[in-house]
């Protein structure tokens, strides 16, 4: 806590400017009016302050706005935002996308800090849903943002926002998240033609069911192995050898290199060996010729 001392003669700040640059802590406390600081926050970032000095300025704002800073101040915090704690930010009501962008810019190039996570949470909750402009902004600054959300949070993403999603934004998503995002993407891209549709839907296919994969196999899409390896195992297992061959097109040769990995390994175990042999890839582990396959899961479903 900074002691309350009188401001020395001639040192009272009339403006927030570089004349404050070498003020001691107690001089800043005594000579800088909090209301003046609040109206001229944008100037602070043009002055090289020490952390100690910034702590004094933050303390002044905290005293002026004990219930949380108004958006007019928040928008101009600049690098002082990095001095805020998540507890400070929880008091804010940020509604403007411009304010959000200004603060994300400050943290640009860094991993998402607890402060940024709290800011985003406050902003999204205030808006009620992740609209396209917000998602656009967040994924531009944090490509992994979408995959940091729970399936429940993702359910509030409107299909229209999916247009803002880039393939790299989904790199760290798990199957549960893709299960939520895939139907939204399918809806968002439904009016596109075959090849364009596949380009857009490709990164979401980790959430696709078997029937959609079967439908894609009829469209000469030539899915690459990287995409195939990210498909849900339970969605791949019912596909026939012919369907997988059509789905992968020229990339089918890549199955050999992946035969020990899921979902390829599990899929091979479900195919007849003589069907696998038709691929000419030397895939081993299929059901030997002459064996009868009982689908117990289907039997249970019928009973």
């Amino acid at each position: 806590e900074v002691e309350k001392t009188a401001c020395p003669s001639g040192k009272k700040a009339r403006e927030i400017d570089e004349s404050l640059i070498f003020y001691k802590k107690w001089e800043l406390e005594a000579c800088v009016d909090a209301a003046l600081l609040a109206t001229q926050m944008d100037r602070v970032n043009a002055i090289p302050f020490t952390y100690e000095q910034l702590d004094v300025l933050k303390h002044k704002l905290d005293e002026l706005y004990p219930q949380g800073y108004p958006e007019s101040v928040i928008q101009h915090l600049g690098y002082l935002f990095l001095k805020m704690s998540p507890e400070d930010i929880r008091k804010w009501n940020v509604t403007s996308l411009e304010t959000l962008k200004a603060l994300l810019e400050v943290n640009k190039g860094h991993e998402m800090s607890p402060q940024v996570a709290t800011l985003i949470d406050r902003f999204v909750k205030g808006r009620g849903q992740l609209d396209k402009d917000t998602l656009d902004t967040l994924t531009a600054f944090y490509p992994g943002y979408l995959c940091s959300l729970s399936p429940e949070e993702l359910s509030s993403v409107p299909p229209s926002s999916i247009w803002a999603v880039r393939p790299q934004d989904l790199d760290t998503c798990d199957p549960r998240q893709l299960d939520v995002l895939y139907p939204k993407a399918r809806l968002a891209f439904q009016n596109m033609n075959g090849s364009e549709y596949f380009v857009k839907i490709q990164s979401f296919l980790g959430g696709a069911p078997t029937e959609d994969l079967k439908a894609l196999s009829q469209q000469n899409v030539s899915m690459d192995l990287a995409t195939f390896m990210k498909l849900r195992t339970d969605a791949v297992l019912p596909l026939t050898v012919a369907e997988v061959q059509k789905l992968l097109g020229p990339h089918v040769e890549g199955l050999k290199a992946e035969e020990r990995h899921r979902p390829v390994r599990d899929w091979i175990l479900r195919q007849r060996q003589d069907d696998l042999d038709t691929l000419g890839l030397g895939l081993q582990g299929g059901i030997p010729n002459g064996y009868l396959v009982l689908d117990l899961s289907m039997q249970e479903a019928l009973s």
Epitope: S19, I21, P48, F49
Partner: antibody
Framework: EVQLLESGGGLVQPGGSLRLSCAAS????????MSWVRQAPGKGLEWVSA????????YYADSVKGRFTISRDNSKNTLYLQMNSLRAEDTAVYYC?????????????WGRGTLVTVSS | IQLTQSPSSLSASVGDRVTITCRAS??????LAWYQQKPGKAPKLLIY???SLESGVPSRFSGSGSGTDFTLTISSLQPEDFATYYC?????????FGGGTKVEIK
């Protein structure tokens, strides 16, 4: 090209004076606080003095206070260090350094340095 | 505020992971920068705000720490990394530098 170029160093006797200059180019000189940092032979770095962008505010390390004066001429894009009452312990390479421009006091651009030797 | 760097010198080979520490005499939050200096050359900024990589600096350099203990790590030492490294605090005046750590070829 963004650069800083120091000059004015040399051999001077104890008690003597010297004026160092630092010519800046490639950036808006008047927008940036500037500093002088020195390095005695075989030793580490020591922050000597700093000045605000307009030249209105200055700061000195205790070791040079009252003997050194920092100033700048923004019309000439030049930083100065007037050194009086020089002592043997002031022998060092003197660097001018530019404030990083991101609120915090670190230096993102340095000159090559000029050597000041104080000896009789 | 005094900054103590350790070790004062170290020998390492190309490809090695190198760690340099900087300890502050009192807490300085994340108000720390790291510089590299080669013989006869000016210092060059590597890291500011304890962990922020300066533009154009290779990603093999990284900084961490907060409070009193800070670390500069070079994940895989390259021939051009043999130099002296300094930390600097900007928590309060006067700004101070560590004594330096010289990284030499083994």
């Amino acid at each position: 090209e963004v650069q800083l170029l120091e000059s004015g160093g040399g051999l001077v006797q104890p008690g003597g004076s010297l004026r160092l200059s630092c010519a800046a180019s490639g950036f808006t000189f008047s927008s940036y606080a500037m500093s002088w940092v020195r390095q005695a032979p075989g030793k580490g770095l020591e922050w000597v003095s700093a000045i605000s962008g307009s030249g209105g505010s200055t700061y000195y390390a205790d070791s040079v206070k009252g003997r050194f004066t920092i100033s700048r001429d923004n019309s000439k894009n030049t930083l100065y260090l007037q050194m009086n009452s020089l002592r043997a312990e002031d022998t060092a390479v003197y660097y001018c350094a530019k404030w990083g421009g991101r609120l915090y006091w670190y230096f993102d651009l340095w000159g090559r340095g000029t050597l000041v030797t104080v000896s009789s | 505020i005094q900054l103590t760097q350790s070790p004062s010198s170290l020998s390492a080979s190309v490809g090695d992971r190198v760690t340099i520490t900087c300890r502050a005499s009192q807490g300085i939050s994340s108000a720390l920068a790291w510089y590299q200096q080669k013989p006869g050359k000016a210092p060059k900024l590597l890291i500011y705000d304890a962990s922020s990589l300066e533009s154009g600096v290779p990603s093999r350099f990284s900084g961490s720490g907060s409070g009193t203990d800070f670390t500069l790590t070079i994940s895989s030492l390259q021939p051009e990394d043999f130099a002296t490294y300094y930390c600097q605090q900007f928590n309060n005046y006067p700004l101070t530098f560590g004594g330096g750590t010289k990284v030499e070829i083994k």
